[in-house]
Interface confidence: low
């Protein structure tokens, strides 16, 4: 009769390292001891009639083990193969290139040391969760490679690379090691240069802003840009908005900066550079200055206007160029009231590499005087109807424009430009008195109050001064305008005084 | 060194306007972002607005939309806001400070310029 | 917008005490920043980034929090740390500032 010997359990996977709890036996009537032959660690726990118990330690490769024992002078043996799964120690994707340009191949490299049973180990490579490459592990340690199209979509994706042990047959499940992710940067660096705004002309210890854009560029946000004046570096704000990066600085010239300079923007992205030049003339512009003798006069002064500009500057003082054309001018008038306010005007051009700078200044004059109280702007007489609504108006001319007070009696005010009930009270002659730092003047005032009943009369008298009135006054405007046009005459035999007298004066 | 120097105190009717200047020196104007904030008496700090002195663009705490309206000169390199329709409510100190990027925040600040709305 | 509150409003602490403040975001924040007010006078930036300490404040102050909770920490009070204390976001607009803790010498 033949008899057996049982090892259980029957060919076990466990993970590399474990214990295993192994029991022989047998249905052969003997007592005889049962032996568990194996290089592995072992330790009797219990046994009896026709079977033994083990425990294995520390089991960390695959290994038969055979169980034995003697029946009817023979011995009968049992056996069991042991199989030993482990994760792999190390599983690394290699470092990506720090900058990948879109449109170009890489290639993601993954390592992978340890792990068995090797038949059951894939290593797979990921972008995101997606799987770009599934292969076996073969050597040890095993390398798996896939090509890669970079894409911008890529652009902070991260890559990994995973292993998957596969134990579903032997009922213990599929078991992942997965790398450390790395993440790829993508971009995209167009062949043209940046568009660089700059000034052509920059004067010294002026600003100006300076402008460096370039489109197409991916990620923008990465981009980093120089932007220079000379050896100078500007301070630039960089904002990007979609693909466009756009970098703004502002220019100043220094004065040892003074010549033909260059305005430079690098943009760098992905250890690539693009490069834009513009040329730039620094140049020192001082002036015009116009000065007058004195900003502020009485009527009748002499007044000296005189502008200066830049030594290689050309003048013009209130339309007129500078005889000889150069950098100086000056015009002498006297002053009159008519003047006051008068703007002088002085434009200087300067030539810079071909092109003309203008500069102008403007400077007022302020002539002081009066005051004035005249007929026009003052009535002497007014004559009206009790009870009627009047605004008596007197107007005083002067600079600064005086005080005007018009009393009667040195105490009874006439309410100007105010709108008044006319009563008897307000009939009487005014003293109206204009007053400023200039001076004083006075005038008399006759307020006339008609009673209803004087109507008629009134009427008729008013009419017949109105008359008069005008009559005189034309006589008074003809004499004017002769006595005027005899002034004139006399003073273009002395040399008027308000001609323009432009002149260079001596370096 | 980096200064805020701002304008002096305003006493202001209601319903008037008032505008405060913040000049700076000491760095480019036009690069850093200038913030407005607001603290009455005794209270905490509100945030107003910002100007980018650069572009001018202006970006405000909506609760202060038609209360401020921040402008910027950068040939004087001056920051101002004018306040309107004033009432007690605007009474307080406001106070200009310079964004100096994530990883300083608001690292200059001015010294203050207290208005006082009273009629 | 994000409210951010301070706890506690009013604190008070001897010298040679650990002080501990916090500041609670309505919604997550990447980072924030803490600021020291003295009475008449503008607030100083005191801690940036979280837990970054500005020029010139000593190194018994700390700061500490991710997400939506901060804290500033005093390891040792001393007199001239009495102040009010603001915390700042500008995760989105508007920028905000909580309340302020005040904190008092005992």
């Known amino acids: 009769q033949e008899f057996l010997l049982r090892v259980e359990p029957q060919n076990p996977v466990l993970s590399a390292g474990g214990s295993l709890f192994v029991n022989c036996s047998t249905d052969c009537p003997s007592s005889e001891k049962i032996a568990l032959e194996t290089s592995l660690s072992k330790e009797l726990v219990a046994s009896g009639m026709g079977w033994a118990a083990f425990n294995l330690s520390n089991v960390t490769g695959n290994s038969r083990i055979l169980c034995s024992v003697y029946c009817n002078g023979s011995q009968i043996t049992g056996s069991s193969n042991i199989t030993v799964y482990g994760l792999p120690e190390r599983v690394e994707l290699a470092p990506l290139p720090p900058w990948q340009p879109v449109g170009q191949n890489f290639t993601l490299r993954c390592q992978v040391e340890g792990g068995s049973p090797r038949t059951s180990l894939t290593v797979v490579l990921l972008r995101w969760e997606e799987e770009l490459s599934r292969q076996p592990a073969v050597e040890e340690p095993a390398e798996v490679t896939a090509t890669v199209l970079a894409s911008r979509d890529d652009h902070g994706a991260p890559f990994s690379c995973r292993t998957e042990l596969d134990m579903q047959p032997q009922g213990l499940g599929l078991f992942v090691n997965t790398s450390a992710p790395r993440q790829l940067r993508t971009f995209v660096l167009p062949v043209t240069p940046p568009r660089l705004v700059a000034p052509r002309f920059l004067e010294v210890e002026t600003s100006w802003p300076v402008d460096c854009t370039l489109d197409g560029l991916f990620p923008a946000s990465e981009a980093q840009v120089y932007l220079a004046l000379g050896d100078q570096m500007l301070n630039a704000t960089v904002m990007n908005h979609g693909d466009t990066l756009t970098a703004t600085a502002t220019a100043t010239a220094r004065a040892d900066q003074e010549g033909a300079r260059e305005i430079v923007c690098n943009v760098t992205l992905g250890g690539e550079r693009r490069e834009a030049r513009e040329n730039l003339t620094v140049f020192s512009f001082l002036g015009p200055i116009v000065n007058l003798t004195k900003p502020e006069v009485s009527e009748g002064t002499e007044v000296t206007v005189k502008c200066e500009a830049h030594p290689r500057a050309k003048v013009t003082l209130n339309g007129v160029p500078a005889q000889p054309l150069g950098p100086r001018a000056q015009l002498l008038l006297k002053a009159t009231p008519e003047d006051n306010g008068r703007s002088f005007s002085c434009s200087a051009t300067l030539e810079v590499a071909g092109q003309l700078i203008h500069k102008n200044q403007t400077r007022e004059l302020r002539v002081l005087y009066g005051p004035r109280l005249d007929e026009r702007d003052c009535p002497g007489n007014w004559t009206w109807p009790e009870n009627s609504q009047q605004t008596p108006m007197c107007q005083a001319w002067g600079n600064p424009l005086p005080e005007l007070k018009c009393l009667k009696d040195g105490t009874f005010p006439l309410p100007i430009g105010e709108s008044v009930t006319v009563t008897r009270d307000l009939e009487g002659t005014y003293l109206c008195r204009a007053r400023s730092t200039q001076g004083e003047v006075t005038r008399k005032v006759t307020v006339n109050v008609l009673s209803p009943r004087y109507e008629i009369v009134i009427i008729t008298v008013v009419a017949a001064a109105v008359i008069m009135g005008t009559a005189g006054l034309s006589t008074y405007l003809y004499n004017r305008q002769r006595k005027i046009k005899k002034y004139r005459l006399q003073q273009a035999q002395k040399g008027t005084p308000m001609k323009p007298n432009t002149q260079a004066t001596p370096p | 060194q980096v200064q805020l120097q701002q304008s002096g105190a305003e006493l202001a009717d209601p319903g008037a306007s008032v505008k405060m200047s913040c000049k700076a020196s000491g760095y480019t104007f036009t690069v850093y972002w200038m913030h407005w904030v607001k603290q009455r008496p005794g209270q905490g700090l509100e945030w107003i607005g910002y100007i980018n002195p650069n572009t001018d663009y202006t970006e405000y705490n909506q609760r202060f939309q038609d209360k401020a309206t921040l402008t910027a000169d950068k040939s004087s390199s001056t920051a101002y806001m004018q306040l309107s329709s004033l009432t007690s409510e605007d009474s307080a100190v406001y106070y200009c400070?310079?964004?100096?990027?994530?990883?300083?925040?608001?690292?200059?600040w001015g010294q203050g310029t207290s208005v006082t709305v009273s009629s | 917008q994000i409210v951010l509150t301070q706890s506690p409003a009013l604190m008070s602490a001897s010298p040679g005490e650990k002080v501990t403040m916090t500041c609670s975001a309505s919604?997550?924040?990447?980072?924030i920043y803490w600021y020291q007010q003295k009475p008449r006078s503008s607030p100083k930036p005191w801690i940036y980034?979280?837990?970054n300490l500005a020029s010139g404040v000593p190194a018994r102050f700390s700061g500490s929090g991710s997400g939506a909770s901060y804290s500033l920490t005093i390891s040792i009070m001393e007199a001239e740390d009495a102040a009010t204390y603001y915390c700042q976001q500008w995760k989105s607009i508007p920028l905000t500032f909580g309340a302020g803790t005040k904190l008092e010498l005992k």
């Open positions: 980034l979280t837990s």
């Open positions: 919604s997550s924040v990447s980072y």
């Open positions: 400070a310079r964004w100096g990027g994530n990883s300083y925040g608001l690292d200059y």
